[in-house]
């Protein structure tokens, strides 16, 4: 997956830091105070979407081959820049009973982006 560098507008991963204070969650999340969540941004032109390296799955690659040739019903489908790899992160927080919990929360960090 590409890292966004400001030079290209192709699907890439953009760095983004989430502060739990900003979204009002600092009263129940003990640690961390924030983290690099990141997000996906950019274009998915057919020549990129059809390549397995940037594609979300084998399925996406196959469908994009049909799309590139204008086959119905895929001709008008738009490929989107989405997370292809996510990572968990450990958090310390208060649960519904105000007990302190340490838990690995799944899919918190975008590691890589690709075309759907």
């Amino acid at each position: 997956g590409l890292e966004c560098d400001g030079k290209v507008n192709i699907c890439c991963k953009k760095q983004f830091f989430v502060s739990f204070k900003d979204i009002g969650w600092n009263d129940w999340i003990i640690a961390p105070s924030g983290y690099h969540a990141n997000y996906c941004e950019g274009e998915c032109p057919s020549h990129i979407a059809g390549t397995s390296g940037s594609s979300l799955s084998f399925h996406s690659t196959v469908i994009n081959h049909y799309r590139m040739r204008g086959h119905s019903p895929f001709a008008n489908l738009k490929s989107c820049c989405v997370p292809t790899k996510l990572r968990p992160m450990s958090m310390l927080y208060y649960d519904d009973g105000q007990n302190i919990i340490k838990k690995d929360i799944q899919n918190m960090i975008v590691e890589e982006c690709g075309c759907s």
Epitope: I23, G24, W25, D27, W28, M91, Y93, D95, D96, G97, I101, K103, I105, Q106, N107, M108
Partner: antibody, heavy 123, light 108 residues
Amino acid sequence: QVQLVQSGAEVKKPGASVKVSCKASGYTFTSYYIHWVRQAPGQGLEWMGAIYAYSGDTNYAQKLQGRVTMTTDTSTSTAYMELRSLRSDDTAVYYCARARDIAAAGLGAFDYWGQGTLVTVSS
Amino acid sequence: EIVLTQSPGTLSLSPGERATLSCRASQSVRSSYLAWYQQKPGQAPRLLIYGASSRATGIPDRFSGSGSGTDFTLTISRLEPEDFAVYYCQQYSNYPRTFGGGTKVEIK
């Protein structure tokens, strides 16, 4: 301490509207969802919908869609539930309850409730 | 929507006895996102159990919850006079949130 204080009892005629308030204190209002639950006389609990105080996003029970509106005023930490076109079967005690609807962290139980507001619909 | 069925509808027991309340879901409740509430006449419900088995703040240890998937149980090991009330299960796995019909625990 956490408190949800609701407005007083109401008597309404069929076809009218009612707006019930729920004033929160003792916690960060925008960190939580406010859910509304009603209970007809001698009956069980019925979930009506929820609003996220941070964003105003709502989720309503299908049977009430189009008749119910939930809003919040973050400046006063108050949630409101308006029910329109009232019928006699809307006679119930209406409760607000708070929850953190964050499934990934296992959160979502209704840990604090308001005292309830009796709404009577009668001609 | 997930339909929750509670049984029995009424449980007639004496103080000191053990109460076992059942809650069955029409489909699997993801990650055991199931809560139990106690309601006494003229009062708002009170959270007893969340996450199927964790006791809420200030709830005595005679209350315990168990189960996963579609079958859940609330157990009161030794009934105290103040435990006679109506008990509801609720799922918070999916929208719409749904409640069971309730089980009334009454004095025999």
